[in-house]
Interface confidence: medium
């Protein structure tokens, strides 16, 4: 007779949906990589549930995740970064559900930072610049960035610009005069690695000059 047969909690657990999703961050802390997983159903009772990754690891067969509130997390140098790993939700030694995942296809870059906008009066444009930690990385170096901006009063009217560099020029005539704008940027892997959009950078706010009535241009 199975030892699990008398465990009512486990029998109930097997009826639950243990779907989960994960993302990896490479060289997120020096040469350390991270892997973060979470259940798709926020109401899953995570008591006694553990995550384990096996395969495509360096020097070890498997690694256990640490639990941080409702997310499960590993920080390690031991990801092989080629081939698929098996990630399982476990209760004790019993696997409830598993997924084969190539960690290079679920990369979530770090958010860009130091976003700023400088108005060039002579050129009648705004130069948007930002920084990314990925310029210094060995692995996820090539990113596509999504710059989004909106007039502050237009809550959901974001204009998006995709670019591979960390510099963008916005023409003054494309923006409303004497208006407050919010701008932010995020990144996604673009080349060998695949995955998800990073978190948005902190927003930057800038005001466009007023129109100079005599010339029809902004001040």
């Amino acid at each position: 007779e199975s030892g699990y047969a008398q465990n009512g909690d486990l029998e109930d657990a097997e009826l639950d949906d243990y779907s989960f999703s994960c993302y990896s961050q490479l060289e997120v802390n020096g040469s350390q990589h991270s892997l973060t997983c979470a259940f798709e159903d926020p109401d899953v009772n995570t008591t006694n549930l553990e995550f384990e990754i096996c395969g495509a690891l360096v020097e070890v067969k498997c690694l256990n995740f640490r639990k941080l509130q409702e997310i499960y997390f590993i920080e390690t140098k031991k990801f092989l970064l080629i081939g698929k790993s098996n990630i399982c939700v476990k209760v004790g030694e019993k696997s409830l559900t598993c997924k084969k995942i190539d960690l290079t296809t679920i990369v979530k870059p770090e958010a860009p930072f130091d976003l700023s906008v400088i108005y060039r009066e002579g050129a009648n444009d705004f130069v948007v610049t930002f920084n990314t930690s990925h310029l210094q990385k060995k692995y996820v170096k090539v990113l596509m960035h999504d710059v989004a901006y909106r007039q502050e009063k237009d809550e959901n009217k974001w204009t998006h610009v995709n670019l591979s560099s960390t510099k963008l020029t916005l023409l003054q005539r494309k923006l409303q005069p004497a208006a407050m704008y919010e701008i932010k940027v995020r990144s996604i892997p673009d080349h060998y690695f695949k995955g998800f959009w990073s978190e948005w950078s902190p927003s930057y706010y800038f005001r466009t000059p007023e129109i100079n009535n005599s010339s029809g241009e902004m001040d």
Epitope: C54, V58, E59, V60, I82, G83, T105
Partner: antibody, heavy 121, light 109 residues
Framework: EVQLVESGGGLVQPGRSLRLSCAAS????????MHWVRQAPGKGLEWVSG????????GYADSVKGRFTIFRDNAKNSLYLQMNSLRAEDTALYYC??????????????WGQGTTVTVSS | AIQLTQSPSSLSASVGDRVTITCRAS??????LAWYQQKPGKAPKLLIY???SLESGVPSRFSGSGSGTDFTLTISSLQPEDFATYYC???????????FGQGTRLEIK
Amino acid sequence: EVQLVESGGGLVQPGRSLRLSCAASGFTFDDHAMHWVRQAPGKGLEWVSGISWNSRGIGYADSVKGRFTIFRDNAKNSLYLQMNSLRAEDTALYYCAKDEYSRGYYVLDVWGQGTTVTVSS
Amino acid sequence: AIQLTQSPSSLSASVGDRVTITCRASQGISSALAWYQQKPGKAPKLLIYDASSLESGVPSRFSGSGSGTDFTLTISSLQPEDFATYYCQQFNSYPLWIAFGQGTRLEIK
């Protein structure tokens, strides 16, 4: 039974092309990176090329870079090596090999019996 | 690229002998090393991975040790079927490449 069967070898003149094939069976082909390794007569093993499960990771030995192309068709459980601008020094027995990264390191745990390529005028 | 140098290139030994083959990497590779055995006319066979883990079905007289730059393959008591050529192998995952040592030929004395 896990099996790799190479084909496509033969006698070819220098400068010509040849395409090797490797038919895989007995395992989930698209879970594994695959490699070509060659062995010239009386010589040691030389890694030629490798390709990740999804074809996004590809590598070549310096001796074949720019001349050989590795590719795979996961739907057909097949691995290929397109060899162009062949030279006499490419003469060798060419093995197809499966990786087994789940062991913790990239190791070649299953090998075919090889197909012979002879480059000679 | 990392170079692997095996020594000796060849050696003669008798049945029952203890034999050690070494593999030196040109730079540290942690324990990213495998050993293969190849008999004439046959494909190579995996013996050891992770520098010291024995492949399933391989006799326990084979063992591997080492990390960093220096690795050894030891056969504790040679059997007639062990006379073959042995190769060490290392890999890199990004960019993808594999390197083999030049081989060590083990012959009957």
